[in-house]
């Protein structure tokens, strides 16, 4: 932004009424009037070029400094060429000197040279030669100097002539201000320019109405340079929640729009399944039956819990059940659907029921499932099971109702055989097993699977209709893993636990060692 000039003294505009002091009195500088464009113009001139040792002073009236720290002095003047005078006027000069003096009071006509400090020697860029002068075509020079810092209540300027032919047409004294400014939704007040050329005055800005400094952001600041220019903006303000930037102001969001935080973004239209918002809304409330999860952004539509899983099947496979379902027909508008499976078992004889999470095994953790199937194993025979599959999403926790579907299945499979080691040798293991008598009639064979411990790459299978088997051709001093499974007309029954049995080492007895009951 361009600097603003505050004028303290303007000789040209004063119309000759300033009455500056000349010294010596009545000699040297003189106030003259000329007509230019039918308007009187005034100037102070001096032209004592023929006489040597000139020391003519022209002092301004006392100028009140006010708030100025550094003043700028603009001079408009003409200087006659010394060669335009007869004999070149050996004592003729083509420069004059500019002085200033600070004081807390007006000394009136009491003029003392010693109080004045020289600012500079003022030399013209162009001098007026004889031919110009005769054609009334004078060369006007413009020079500017600055002084600062000033500290007293006021000051004088003085012009010393040392033998030149000078006409002073304009003396303008001013100081500079950085103008009032609106930038980055911050207001910066009019600020006096500093006095020291290299320094920049730091000025704090104030956020405009309904604007704030964003969290973690820098307070708005600008720097006012000596020349009255604003430089180096730092930080900014942003329109607060519920307001958006319109030119250099923050305007409330229109009804039906919202803005949930201080940001540069405009107000957004209320998303789906929200109620129309009032003016200046920071969010849009959800319609009845719709919700926002804590982590949902305000720009996301309101959503609701899903409907129940659409279709659920429970397929019994021996001591296992495969549960399969399809996603809810209504997802509630969300993609974060997860499923939870719970299990209840009922004894057919008593009708007594209870949870069965502790006794069954799921193919993957039954809570927070993202897939639509799970296998439940280790089910007990002659038991009725009811499985509940619940669909949940990010807003299910905000309502008390649940969305679930249930499926029931009866397990008719045999109980796992109870296995024991009857005897062993260096190369064989004798194994027996039992199941409850009521179930024996449904078993047509038993399958014995055995393998070396640590080796699941190979295994052996023996099938038998009896309740015992001798596994031979085994390696000495080797641990075997043995499992017995009943085979029924429906397929495989429940398998026994996997048992560890070890053959004898060659140093031990070669006979079959019998294990006592």
């Amino acid at each position: 932004a361009q600097g603003k000039e505050v004028v303290l003294l303007d000789f040209a505009a004063a119309g000759g009424e300033l009455g500056w002091l000349t010294h010596p009195y009545g000699k040297g500088w003189d106030l003259m009037q000329n007509i230019m464009n039918d308007m009187p113009i005034y100037m102070y001139s001096v032209c004592n070029v023929m006489s040597g040792d000139q020391d003519n002073w022209l002092r301004t009236n006392w100028v009140y400094r006010g708030e100025a720290e550094r003043i700028f002095i603009e001079l408009k003047f003409t200087v006659r060429d010394c060669n335009s005078f007869p004999g070149g006027a050996s004592s003729c000069k083509e420069t004059f000197n500019l002085y200033y003096a600070e004081s807390d009071l007006d000394y009136g006509t009491n003029f003392q040279k010693r109080l004045f400090t020289k600012i500079d020697t003022i030399a013209p860029d162009e001098i007026t030669v004889s031919s110009d002068f005769e054609a009334r075509h004078v060369k006007l020079n413009v020079e500017e100097r600055s002084v600062g810092p000033l500290t007293r209540k006021g000051f004088y300027l003085a012009f010393q002539d040392i033998g030149a032919c000078v006409a002073l047409l304009s003396v303008r004294v001013y100081y500079k201000k950085c103008p009032e400014l609106l930038q980055g939704l911050a207001h910066f007040p009019e600020t006096i320019a500093g006095s020291d050329a290299p320094s920049l005055a730091t000025v704090a800005g104030t956020c405009v109405d309904h604007a704030v400094v964003p969290p973690g952001g820098e307070e708005p600041r600008m720097h006012c340079a000596v020349d009255g220019e604003w430089l180096v903006p730092i930080g900014q303000c942003l329109c607060q929640a519920g307001y958006e930037k319109v030119e250099d102001a923050c305007q409330a969001c229109s009804p039906g729009f919202f803005k949930f935080e201080a940001s540069e973004s405009p107000c957004l239209e209320c998303p789906e399944h929200t109620l129309p918002s009032p003016e200046g809304a920071t969010s849009c409330e959800c319609e009845e039956g719709f919700f926002r999860a804590p982590q949902d952004p305000a720009s996301m539509p309101c959503t609701r819990p899903p409907s129940a899983p659409h279709y659920l099947t429970a397929v019994g496979m021996g001591a296992k059940v495969e549960l399969r379902w399809t996603p809810p027909q209504d997802s509630g508008g969300r993609e974060d659907i997860v499923y939870s499976v719970t299990c209840e078992q009922c004894w057919p004889e008593s009708g007594e029921c209870g949870p069965c999470e502790a006794s069954v095994r799921y193919s993957e953790p039954p809570h927070g499932l993202t897939r639509t199937s799970v296998t439940v194993s280790d089910l007990e025979p002659h038991m009725n099971y009811t499985f509940t599959v619940e669909a949940r999403n990010g807003v299910s926790g905000l309502v008390t109702s649940r969305s679930f579907r249930t499926a029931s299945v009866s397990i008719n499979q045999t109980e796992p055989p109870k296995v024991r080691l009857e005897g062993r040798s260096t190369t064989s293991l004798s194994v027996s097993w039992s199941i409850p008598p009521p179930q024996q009639s449904r078993v047509w064979k038993y399958e014995v699977t055995y393998r070396k411990k640590g080796d699941s790459n190979s295994y052996n299978v023996r099938r038998t209709e009896g309740f015992s088997v001798t596994l031979d051709d085994l390696a000495p001093d080797t641990t075997y893993l043995v499992q017995v499974q009943a085979l029924t007309q429906e397929g495989q029954g429940a398998g026994s636990k996997v048992h560890e049995f070890q053959t004898l080492s060659p140093e031990g007895s070669g006979n079959l060692a019998v294990i006592g009951g």
Epitope: T449, R451, K452, K453, G454, D455, S456, N457, S458, Y459, N460, V461, T479, L481, V498
Partner: antibody
Framework: QIQLVQSGPELKKPGETVKISCKAS????????MNWVKQAPGKGLKWMGW????????TYADDFKGRFAFSLETSASTAYLQINNLKNEDTATYFC????????????WGQGTTLTVSS | DVVMTQTPLSLPVSLGDQASIPCRSS???????????LHWYLQKPGQSPKLLIY???NRFSGVPDRFSGSGSGTDFTLKISRVEAEDLGVYFC?????????FGGGTKLEIK
């Protein structure tokens, strides 16, 4: 749940040695064998052999006899594949895999370790 | 060694279509214990193979029922009844009847 987690990628020069690890969790490590499978870039799968995790006895496929060694650190439930005197053709992804819920087939696999051999 | 042959190398399909992936072994895969140890795996880019079907026709836990396996002796087929985007990848057949265990070269299922 059952997991096989393998060590990270390796960049080696020909002639060097590499040792890849496979850490098992979620089951009894010493009950089930550990197999190793090689997959060269853009190629199919090649079974390298297996180790009995209880006895430590290794079995190698014919193409992997000599420079290849399977070993165990039972206390850490970890199996190792070491390849000595590396050659450019050893550049591949190596998988550990184990028959656990089903016998005699690879139903659980590690995520694979990429080995690059280049001078 | 038993050689497992998979053709074609690439099988373009449209989503929702049925896909059939054949696999042939150089000798019978029937074990002396009566089992046929022929399995199918799916490998997606940057991942390890995942077991889909074991012993010819048994679906592994969590595998959708659109996958089915069939065959006997030396000729086997994996069928996908309605191909979904998540089914794309390389399908390998594998045998563990005979040592060394061997894998087919793979068939890449891709969008037509």
């Amino acid at each position: 749940q059952i997991q096989l987690v393998q060590s990270g990628p390796e960049l080696k020069k020909p002639g060097e040695t590499v040792k890849i690890s496979c850490k098992a969790s979620g089951y009894t490590f010493t009950d089930y064998s550990m197999n190793w499978v090689k997959q060269a870039p853009g190629k199919g799968l090649k079974w390298m052999g297996w180790i009995n995790t209880y006895t430590g006895e290794p079995t190698y496929a014919d193409d992997f006899k000599g420079r290849f060694a399977f070993s165990l650190e039972t206390s850490a439930s970890t199996a190792y594949l070491q390849i000595n005197n590396l050659k450019n053709e050893d550049t591949a992804t190596y998988f550990c895999a184990s028959p656990i819920s089903l016998l005699r087939l690879l139903d659980y696999w590690g995520q694979g370790t990429t080995l690059t051999v280049s001078s | 060694d038993v050689v497992m042959t998979q053709t074609p190398l690439s099988l373009p399909v449209s989503l929702g279509d049925q896909a059939s992936i054949p696999c042939r072994s150089s000798q019978s895969l029937v074990h002396s214990n009566g089992n046929t140890y022929l399995h199918w795996y799916l490998q997606k880019p940057g991942q390890s193979p995942k077991l889909l079907i074991y012993k010819v026709s048994n679906r592994f836990s969590g595998v959708p029922d659109r996958f089915s396996g069939s065959g006997s002796g030396t000729d086997f087929t994996l069928k996908i009844s309605r191909v979904e985007a998540e089914d794309l990848g390389v399908y390998f057949c594998s045998q563990s009847t005979h040592v060394p265990w061997t894998f087919g070269g793979g068939t890449k299922l891709e969008i037509k």
